[in-house]
Interface confidence: low
């Protein structure tokens, strides 16, 4: 099978996280059907999954994926070597760490092997698509009679991450949020010793090393304080 590879050219929106081009066609045919959009996420800069909605195809089709890096030493076209499948149809590609170059423009091309002219190319800024693992090892320290300090670890260089801390007592209807930058430390200056506090944290690859919008999963919660809030009407509702 001869596969035609489209190398992107012309003007591109360099501020966008991706740039989509489709092959022009002269007549209405299968080749005019748009290909599904490819979505890529880099997980903790350990591997990357680029996926598409295979069920959007009019009939089951094993779409193929190629990729390269624009204007770099890694601009050689690569075939996907590890496809992801959904109901035995290709629905994604997984790239390993050595194939990920965060600060070069990643070009990904999806193609219908039965219709070589039916192909779409996207340009992605991978540093904006990093999702870190959830924060780990949450610990609480009592700095004074009423002050708590929350610490945690991330399995990535801390400098690249910002964090969101949420906390609440068993009496609260909702979480209180606080943004924390890469120093991954948070202090709560006024703690009520009669209440039980719950803390959780999530992290994002932003803003020093990238501009990712997606947060990690929430950490496992950590608790502090009284376990006996028998009169608290919200206790059980908040466990969900």
């Amino acid at each position: 099978l001869n596969t035609t590879i489209l190398t992107p050219n012309g003007n591109e929106d360099t501020t966008a996280d991706f740039f989509l081009t489709t092959m022009p066609t002269d007549s209405l045919s299968v080749s005019t059907l748009p290909l599904p959009e490819v979505q890529c996420f880099v997980f903790n800069v350990e591997y990357m999954n680029c996926t598409w909605n295979s069920s959007s195809e009019p009939q089951p089709t094993n779409l193929t994926l190629h990729y390269w890096y624009k204007n770099s030493d890694n601009d050689k076209v690569q075939k996907c070597s590890h496809y992801l499948f959904s109901e035995e149809i290709t629905s994604g590609c997984q790239l390993q760490k050595k194939e990920i170059h965060l600060y070069q423009t990643f070009v990904v091309q999806l193609q219908d092997p039965r219709e070589p002219r039916r192909q779409a190319t996207q340009m992605l800024k991978l540093q904006n698509l990093v999702i870190p693992w959830a924060p780990e090892n949450l610990t609480l320290h009592k700095l004074s009679e009423s002050q708590l300090e929350l610490n945690w670890n991330n399995r990535f260089l801390n400098h690249c991450l910002e964090h969101l801390v949420q906390y609440r007592t068993d009496w609260d209807h909702s979480w209180t949020e606080q943004s924390v930058d890469y120093r991954h430390k948070f202090s709560l200056p006024s703690v009520d010793g009669q209440k039980r506090y719950t803390f959780r944290v999530r992290s994002r690859f932003n803003p020093l090393c990238g501009s990712a919008q997606h947060w990690s999963e929430w950490s496992h919660p950590i608790h502090w304080g009284s376990n006996t809030s028998k009169e608290n009407p919200f206790l059980f509702a908040l466990e969900a």
């Epitope: 800069v45 965060l102 600060y103 260089l157 801390n158 400098h159 690249c160 991450l161 606080q178 943004s179 924390v180 930058d181 890469y182 120093r183 991954h184 430390k185 948070f186 202090s187 200056p189 020093l208 090393c209």
Partner: antibody, heavy 121, light 112 residues
Framework: QVQLQQWGAGLLKPSETLSLTCAVY????????WSWIRQPPGKGLEWIGE???????NYNPSLKSRVTISVDTSKNQFSLKLSSVTAADTAVYYC???????????????WGQGTLVTVSS | DVVMTQSPLSLPVTLGQPASISCRSS???????????LDWYLQKPGQSPQLLIY???NRASGVPDRFSGSGSGTDFTLKISRVEAEDVGVYYC?????????FGQGTKVEIK
């Protein structure tokens, strides 16, 4: 014990490119940013920029258009290039460790010995 | 950029006497996580700077306890309880709460 040893050309002509390298001994590259800081003769300190082990850089906006910091993790080294130098770039240039991601220590806890770079026609 | 202003710029001191240096920032250095990202460095004559104090009031490893840091927000102070001969040099404050990191202009401490 962490040690930073730096070297590079000490005398440049205007419009040339300053090039310095800093080698790190006794410390893994990962987990820290590695910075360049300069000090014009008789003046204060100015932070230039930083790089981590994976090559991610942050630069002082006042110098960003002329600065490139790179890293060679296989040698535990990082380098500074400053293009189109003028007499105003004459300074002692320091490499330093930091900042770390954690707030358990100060921003720059280990420093190189400094390299005097003079720009003169 | 955050401007860091130190005073005095020159400080003649007597051995064994206390000394105090002020550092003011143009913006509050209290970070969203509650900490003041303010370091103090000493640059002895002919040497590279060395870290003395971090987070406003924490002594770095190996720093004598005659050095102390205090303050919060925009006003910070470095105190030397009893000046020794080896304390001469230029003292700099550095803020790490706002990008980019900026230093004060330095305070030169010398023996009278």
């Amino acid at each position: 014990q962490v040690q930073l040893q730096q070297w590079g050309a000490g005398l440049l002509k205007p419009s040339e490119t300053l090039s310095l390298t800093c080698a790190v001994y006794g410390e893994s590259f990962s987990g820290y940013y590695w910075s360049w800081i300069r000090q014009p003769p008789g003046k204060g300190l100015e932070w230039i920029g930083e790089i981590n082990h994976s090559g991610s850089t942050n630069y002082n906006p006042s110098l960003k258009s002329r600065v490139t910091i790179s890293v060679d993790t296989s040698k535990n080294q990082f380098s500074l290039k400053l293009s189109s130098v003028t007499a105003a770039d004459t300074a002692v240039y320091y490499c330093a460790r930091g900042p770390a991601g954690s707030s358990s220590s100060g921003y720059f806890d280990y420093w190189g010995q400094g390299t005097l770079v003079t720009v003169s026609s | 950029d955050v401007v860091m202003t130190q005073s005095p710029l020159s400080l003649p001191v007597t051995l064994g006497q206390p000394a105090s240096i002020s550092c003011r920032s143009s913006q509050s250095l209290v970070h969203s996580n509650g900490y003041n990202y303010l370091d103090w460095y000493l640059q002895k004559p002919g040497q590279s700077p060395q870290l003395l104090i971090y987070l406003g009031s924490n002594r770095a490893s190996g720093v004598p306890d005659r050095f102390s840091g205090s303050g919060s927000g925009t006003d910070f102070t470095l105190k030397i309880s009893r000046v020794e001969a080896e304390d001469v040099g230029v003292y700099y404050c550095l803020q790490g709460s706002h990008w980019p990191w900026t230093f004060g202009q330095g305070t030169k401490v010398e023996i009278k």
